[in-house]
Interface confidence: low
């Protein structure tokens, strides 16, 4: 039986050129986390596997930083990074938890000005 | 059910080459971890290299930057290139597979997951 929830940082807003840290944590379970993947719609951002460490995809190589912990960096944002991205967590023995977050990159007078979008 | 089977092993000197292949029939082309490991008489089996089912590798200390490993593009046949081979590389050599989450390689260990029967590499000097 699954009993483990994955908090994330919800929808989020992050200022076009900055950068902004996805975060997803797995609680309530006692599953051994073996793999955490991040994705944005259908792409493959990276992969931190517990035996075999870190591998970013080629081609966000440049703007991809794994981390803080099992955490990913995103690095000079463009307006195309809006979307959502998804935190998958392979666990042993309990399966996949999946977590979704929603990011919008917004230009800097928008950001500025504190829009932010209401979690629901 | 999942087979493997090794081969390519032999007889070589020091300093020589040579490829092992494991042909694996009922693995799933996704989540499994693939990898190499070999016993020498009177030690422990010990594991030489893994990739996982997204190619991420890991390899022994002993055996970096001498040894490489790979899977075709239909992941049906795992490799291992052995290069530069040392007399203490000699050992039977084993093929295994464990269908851990994600292609997880850490559960993979003798007494779990998928084995071949091996194939001997003997290095002399």
């Known amino acids: 039986m699954m009993t483990g929830t994955i908090e994330t940082t919800g929808n989020i807003s992050a200022e076009k050129g900055g950068s902004i840290i996805l975060q997803c944590h797995l609680s309530s379970t006692t599953a051994q986390v073996t793999q955490v993947n991040w994705e944005q719609q259908d792409q493959l951002l990276a992969i931190c596997n517990a035996d075999l460490g870190w591998h970013i995809s080629p081609s966000f190589k440049d703007r991809v930083a794994p981390g803080p912990g099992l955490g990913l960096t995103l690095q000079s944002l463009t307006v195309n990074d809006t979307g959502e991205y998804f935190c998958i967590y392979h666990t042993y023995p309990d399966g996949t938890y999946t977590g979704r977050i929603f990011l919008e990159v917004l230009e800097s007078s928008v950001a500025e000005h504190g829009a932010r979008f209401q979690i629901p | 059910q999942v087979q493997l089977a090794e081969s390519g092993g032999g007889s070589v000197q020091t300093g020589g080459s040579l490829r092992l292949s494991c042909e694996a029939s009922g693995v799933a082309a996704s989540g499994y971890c693939m990898a190499w490991f070999r016993q020498a008489p009177g030690k422990e089996r010990e594991r030489v290299a893994a990739?996982?089912?997204?190619?991420?590798?890991a390899y022994a200390d002993s055996v970096k930057g001498r040894f490489t490993i790979s899977k075709d593009n239909a992941k049906t046949t795992l490799y291992l290139q052995m290069n530069n081979l040392k007399p203490e590389d000699t050992a039977m050599y084993y093929c295994a597979a464990d269908g851990g989450y994600g292609g997880y390689c850490g559960r993979l260990r003798p007494g779990t997951g998928y084995w071949g029967q091996g194939t001997q590499v003997t290095v002399s000097s």
């Open positions: 990739i996982s089912s997204n190619d991420l590798v």
